[in-house]
Amino acid sequence: SQVSQNCHNGSYEISVLMMGNSAFAEPLKNLEDAVNEGLEIVRGRLQNAGLNVTVNATFMYSDGLIHNSGDCRSSTCEGLDLLRKISNAQRMGCVLIGPSCTYSTFQMYLDTELSYPMISAGSFGLSCDYKETLTRLMSPARKLMYFLVNFWKTNDLPFKTYSWSTSYVYKNGTETEDCFWYLNALEASVSYFSHELGFKVVLRQDKEFQDILMDHNRKSNVIIMCGGPEFLYKLKGDRAVAEDIVIILVDLFNDQYFEDNVTAPDYMKNVLVLTLSPGNSLLNSSFSRNLSPTKRDFALAYLNGILLFGHMLKIFLENGENITTPKFAHAFRNLTFEGYDGPVTLDDWGDVDSTMVLLYTSVDTKKYKVLLTYDTHVNKTYPVDMSPTFTWKNSKLPNDITGRGPQ
């Protein structure tokens, strides 16, 4: 049956899916606060522009008794149940915000007409790439992959004079939703990362990882993993590590590395941390007061989703264009809008662009220092520290093949 969109005559509604299964274990109340804060800003901006319209959000909750795992494993059915709920209520907003799980987003995208935009805080997997009406406001796996390939190939920096073409990937199946899909993308045999590397092996057991650290017959000096320093310590502990091992720790949504009083533990000296450029300092807004760094990014993506909708609504209303059209549904890409905390850029496929930062541990100060940054929008690396105080020989990253490192 045809679902009508509550999206005309000066009244514009946002459908927000409040799913029990979520990319991050965030209390739904915090997400509601983020959405409501976003609505206040959107209303103010529309009012400033002389647009006298009403913008509201409808929160749609799924049945927690059926879908209560709390993670993304059972999210496929939950997403479809929520779509059924919308269909039964015969009521849909101008835009759908949520879901955040890759499984549910993929399935919901397949099962819906492309007549309205979907905005997701998550949906990290490659299966959600290149979806015409899907916008993702947290860095998807494709962006990570492109950085890694770019960095592997780089050989003209004072601290990296070798191109790399090999890697181990540690993936034990207990990862968080973001890490699961990041590593899944690296593992996939048809992915860009796999295509560009000559050798890649996935390590699935703790012991496999631990053995590689000192194995003279290892096929690569580089190991990619995903998680925080504590996750690495549980795995690596204080074990000795061969001097030409480089661990790349992907920890995008964690800005603890940039806090003034943070000292890098000793076990991080062989590690390069890949994270996102820290968000601008948030004031005590109602939704961010008690959030951890990761959850802050998740809640902020919800808030920015509301601001993105407001941005597009304003443009279409000012141009006298209809909101309930395929043109509107396909418009949430290739633009920059005013996010809560600064400019947010979306690429041609509606995926957020960002500045990734590669950190190293200074052997002098035991602090995390920025080695280089990478702009996902232009796929370009910008060296920052031309004379890093590395643990590696000659303050250069070693070759990725054992025995051919800097002499």
């Epitope: 400033n48 601008n280 300092s281 920059t336 005013e338």
Partner: antibody, heavy 116, light 106 residues
Framework: QVQLKESGPGLVAPSQSLSITCTVS????????ISWVRQPPGKGLEWLGV???????NYNSALKSRLSIRKENSKSQVFLKMNSLQTEDTARYFC??????????WGQGTLVTVSA | QIVLTQSPAIMSASPGEKVTMTCSAS?????MHWYQQKSGTSPKRWIY???KLASGVPARFSGSGSGTSYSLTITSMEAEDAATYYC?????????FGGGTKLEIK
């Protein structure tokens, strides 16, 4: 109606710091970003920095090390602080309501002269 | 940082004459805004989002362009249009102004 008003010291000695307050009315700082712009006598406009609705900031990269912008939403005030002033920092300093559709409202500006 | 170059720096036009000034960006930008400033006053937003006229701006003004090339046009110059016009972008860093075009009446 929307108004912005800058208040500053007028005269600042070289190497000293500058503090200017922008007091706004007719709109909320929790819904609108504010930029600072300056204009040396007889010259063009130079954007200094912006404070976003959420309190985050971006600065002109050439001046980043000397600038800081903060705000108090409840007092409807935005503060610009600039360190190590030199004579070339003599200018009229404006605050302006900022969005991605430009700077739609400006204050009248406050003239800052850097001189011994 | 995106650099905006306005040309000409100074120009004069007779009443009724068509006027076009340009703003060139060092790399592609999404939108361009234009401001009018008369001597001793604050700038006023004049054209925003490349082509939209700010409130109270006469219909003889128009803006156009995309990528790295933008322009402001006055179809029929009037005395009150004499002022300095600045272009400004919000695609990088996030803001920069052009050096201005001073428009005088002949």
């Amino acid at each position: 109606q929307v108004q912005l008003k800058e208040s500053g010291p007028g005269l600042v000695a070289p190497s000293q710091s500058l503090s200017i307050t922008c007091t706004v009315s007719g709109f909320s700082l929790s819904r609108n970003a504010i930029s600072w712009v300056r204009q040396p006598p007889g010259k063009g406009l130079e954007w200094l920095g912006v404070i976003w609705t959420g309190g985050g900031t971006n600065y002109n990269s050439a001046l980043k090390s000397r600038l800081s912008i903060r705000k108090e939403n409840s007092k409807s005030q935005v503060f610009l602080k600039m360190n190590s002033l030199q004579t070339e920092d003599t200018a009229r300093y404006f605050c302006a309501r900022s969005g991605y559709d430009g700077f739609d409202y400006w204050g009248q500006g406050t003239l800052v002269t850097v001189s011994a | 940082q995106i650099v905006l170059t306005q040309s000409p720096a100074i120009m004069s036009a007779s009443p009724g004459e068509k006027v076009t000034m340009t703003c060139s960006a060092s790399s592609s930008v999404n939108y361009m805004h234009w401001y009018q400033q008369k001597s001793g006053t604050s700038p006023k937003r004049w054209i925003y989002d490349t082509s939209k006229l700010a409130s109270g701006v006469p219909a003889r003004f128009s803006g156009s362009g995309s990528g790295t090339s933008y322009s402001l046009t006055i179809t029929s110059m009037e005395a009150e249009d004499a002022a300095t016009y600045y272009c400004q972008q919000w695609s990088g860093n996030p803001y920069t102004f052009g050096g201005g075009t001073k428009l005088e009446i002949k």
